[in-house]
């Protein structure tokens, strides 16, 4: 079975980790693939290792574990996320987490960042 | 319409390395959503499950072959095949190669080569 | 290893019977057993996945039912190209194991 948190939130401008859980008592996994709607975003194979979609590279690391953590946040990154389990002899698992992009709690309380600098 | 084909020698002498061939026509093996099984059927007897291979070179097989069977994936010539080393007389079989699918939960051997009989003898 | 037990191991009937098949796993394998029917010199062909799902293009007179170790496949009117060997398969865990196969015959 798949195991993942459904719904979570995160800032505009922050990152996010997507994860999700896989138990079986008698599947092997092989693979695992990761996708923003139908886009891949990143695939996991035990034999060749990490693939990370060339336009997510800037933004997506892969791990922790067979999870990925999604950087650099932005409002269109709010979505459905999937991922996928090829797993012998059991099959195709499949998991799904809702991603909600919210505005940064600055931008939200209307505040201006300011970066200062040592002096002297 | 998926289609398998096994090519190999039909006559292996003891103590040699049987190698066998499945060529894949109306599909890619390179699918993610499939797996690939050698399977073999003694003359007059049932079916034992040799081994099965993603595309990515895991591989699955039966310990009573304990380390005798190798199964490599050639993705450029849509091909996996068989190697089993040290064979006797006990291996002289009906080779058959399969694709595990549909997409189900722990899916059965949905489309079939047609079987090659490989003998063992000197 | 899971041992797959078929009954009867061979059996004969007539055109127009209801034949009935049993499996038993040494364990619970869930609903992950299929059926296979091979005729002579012919490689086996899906008939049932997941105990009871009929594959795409077989005559719904095949049928099968049960879950966890017990398992049954079933004719219910019997024809003439059904005359063949069947098999039972688990696919829960790995060594993939088979029955020992029924062969319907002609009586």
């Known amino acids: 079975t798949i195991d993942t948190k459904r719904n979570i939130s995160a800032e505009e401008g922050g990152s996010v980790i997507l994860q999700c859980h896989f138990s079986s008592d008698t599947a092997e996994v092989t693979q695992v693939d990761w996708k923003q709607q139908d886009q891949l975003l990143a695939i996991y194979s035990v034999d060749l290792g990490w693939h990370v979609a060339s336009v997510f590279s800037d933004r997506v690391v892969p791990g922790p574990s067979l999870g990925l953590t999604f950087q650099s946040l932005t409002m269109n990154d709010t979505g459905e996320y999937f991922c996928t389990y090829h797993t012998y002899p059991g099959g195709i698992y499949k998991g799904r987490i809702f991603l909600k992009v919210q505005e940064s709690s600055d931008d939200r309380n209307g505040l201006a960042q300011f970066q200062t600098a040592p002096l002297g | 319409q998926l289609q398998l084909q096994e090519s190999g020698p039909g006559l292996v002498k003891p103590a040699e390395t049987l190698s066998l061939t499945c060529t894949v026509s109306?599909?890619?093996?390179?699918?993610?959503?499939?797996?690939w099984t050698w399977i073999r059927q003694p003359p007059g007897k049932g079916l034992e499950w040799i081994g099965t291979v993603y595309y990515s070179g895991s591989t699955f097989h039966n310990p009573s072959l304990k380390s005798r069977v190798t199964i490599p994936v050639d993705t450029s010539k849509n091909q996996f095949s068989l190697k089993l080393s040290s064979v006797t007389a006990a291996d002289t079989a009906v080779y058959y190669c399969?694709?595990?699918?549909?997409?189900?939960?722990?899916?059965?051997?949905?489309?079939w080569g047609q079987g090659t009989l490989v003998t063992v003898s000197s | 290893d899971i041992q797959m037990t078929q009954s009867p191991s061979s059996l004969s009937a007539s055109v127009g019977d209801r034949v009935t098949i049993t499996c038993r796993a040494s364990q619970s394998i869930s609903s992950y057993l299929n059926w296979y029917q091979q005729k002579p010199g012919k490689a086996p062909k899906l008939l049932i996945y997941?105990?009871?799902s009929l594959q795409s293009g077989v005559p719904s007179r095949f049928s099968g039912s049960g879950s966890g170790t017990d398992f049954t496949l079933t004719i219910s009117s019997l024809q003439p190209e059904d005359f063949a060997t069947y098999y039972c398969?688990?696919?829960?865990?790995?060594?993939?194991?088979f029955g020992g196969g029924t062969k319907v015959e002609i009586k």
């Open positions: 399969a694709r595990v699918g549909p997409d189900v939960s722990h899916p059965p051997f949905d489309y």
């Open positions: 109306g599909g890619s093996i390179s699918s993610y959503d499939h797996y």
């Open positions: 398969q688990q696919s829960y865990s790995t060594p993939i194991t």
């Open positions: 997941a105990a009871s």
